[in-house]
């Protein structure tokens, strides 16, 4: 009997109660490998889950999350809510980014604004909860005495062609 069962292909199960050994999986069930003694119940994508791929006799349904949620865990076993830009998801729900931090995505955590002065630059555009600061030229470059003229091109040595 074991040998006969191993001949049952995916999409069927080995039915010991019938003379025809390999029986097709009943509706809403599947077997993804051959030689199965039972078919598995198809996953149902309900509530915050939506169907990404329908169940077939040989493969389980695949779920996704409805708008406003994103998948977590193996095979999208959980749906975690999205937050708005300018927020981060905590264990107690979506919270606004603290001053000095931002999040430009619907998931993830708030990150500190770039410290422009560490690169010797100045803040060109202030940061918000949703956007990082934009760094501009260094403060020295913006001082009244600084020339904004284009510096002269370096002189070429005779006999050298331009790079």
């Amino acid at each position: 009997l074991q040998d006969l069962c191993s001949n049952c292909p995916a999409g069927t199960f080995c039915d010991n109660n019938r003379s025809q050994i390999c029986s097709p999986c009943p509706p809403n069930s599947f077997s993804s490998a051959g030689g199965q003694r039972t078919c598995d119940i198809c996953r149902q994508c309900k509530g915050v889950f939506k169907t990404r791929k329908e169940c077939s006799s040989t493969s389980n349904a695949e779920c996704d999350c409805i708008s406003g949620y994103h998948c977590l865990g193996a095979e999208c076993s959980m749906c975690e809510q999205d937050c708005k830009q300018g927020q981060e998801l905590t264990k107690k729900g979506c919270k606004d980014c603290c001053f000095g931090t931002f999040n430009d995505q619907k998931r993830g955590i708030c990150r500190p604004w770039t410290n422009c002065s560490l690169d010797g630059k100045s803040v060109l555009v202030n940061g918000t909860k949703e956007r990082d600061v934009v760094c501009g030229p260094s403060p020295a470059d913006l001082s009244p005495g600084a020339s904004s003229a284009t510096p002269p091109a370096p002189a070429r040595e005779p006999g050298h062609s331009p790079q």
């Epitope: 998801l89 905590t90 264990k91 107690k92 955590i109």
Partner: nanobody, 124 residues
Framework: EVQLVESGGGLVQPGGSLRLSCAAS????????MTWVRQAPEKGLEWVST????????YYADSVKGRFTISRDSSKNTLYLQMNSLRAEDSAVYFC?????????????????WGQGTTVTVSS
């Protein structure tokens, strides 16, 4: 391979109790905080409780405070959730999760591994 396997779910009447277990393997259990979360059929993920690696710090969602107790037994590499005075709104799939550090937090998720879940149904 890091693995978390939940058990203990089932059907219980309102006011009843259940104890969920989560068997951990593939990592040093006492070195990491652990968390329980749940997902009801029509809702997104809801944090339930977190316990530190040492077991001395615990946090609970307001919705379960005073009714649920999280605990751990490092000799058995097992996390527990004792659920008392169960209500219909506690019906959900319960997942245990490993956090990335030993320190417990009631703010950030630091989860890097999830279990497959166990179903709790509270109904008369």
């Amino acid at each position: 391979e890091v693995q978390l396997v939940e058990s203990g779910g089932g059907l219980v009447q309102p006011g009843g109790s259940l104890r969920l277990s989560c068997a951990a393997s593939g990592f040093t259990f006492s070195s990491f905080a652990m968390t329980w979360v749940r997902q009801a059929p029509e809702k997104g993920l809801e944090w339930v409780s977190t316990i530190s690696g040492s077991g001395d710090t615990t946090y609970y969602a307001d919705s379960v405070k005073g009714r649920f107790t999280i605990s751990r037994d490092s000799s058995k590499n097992t996390l527990y959730l004792q659920m008392n005075s169960l209500r219909a709104e506690d019906s959900a799939v319960y997942f245990c999760a490993k956090e990335a550090t030993a320190m417990a937090s009631d703010y950030y998720y630091g989860v890097d591994v999830w279990g497959q879940g166990t179903t709790v149904t509270v109904s008369s």
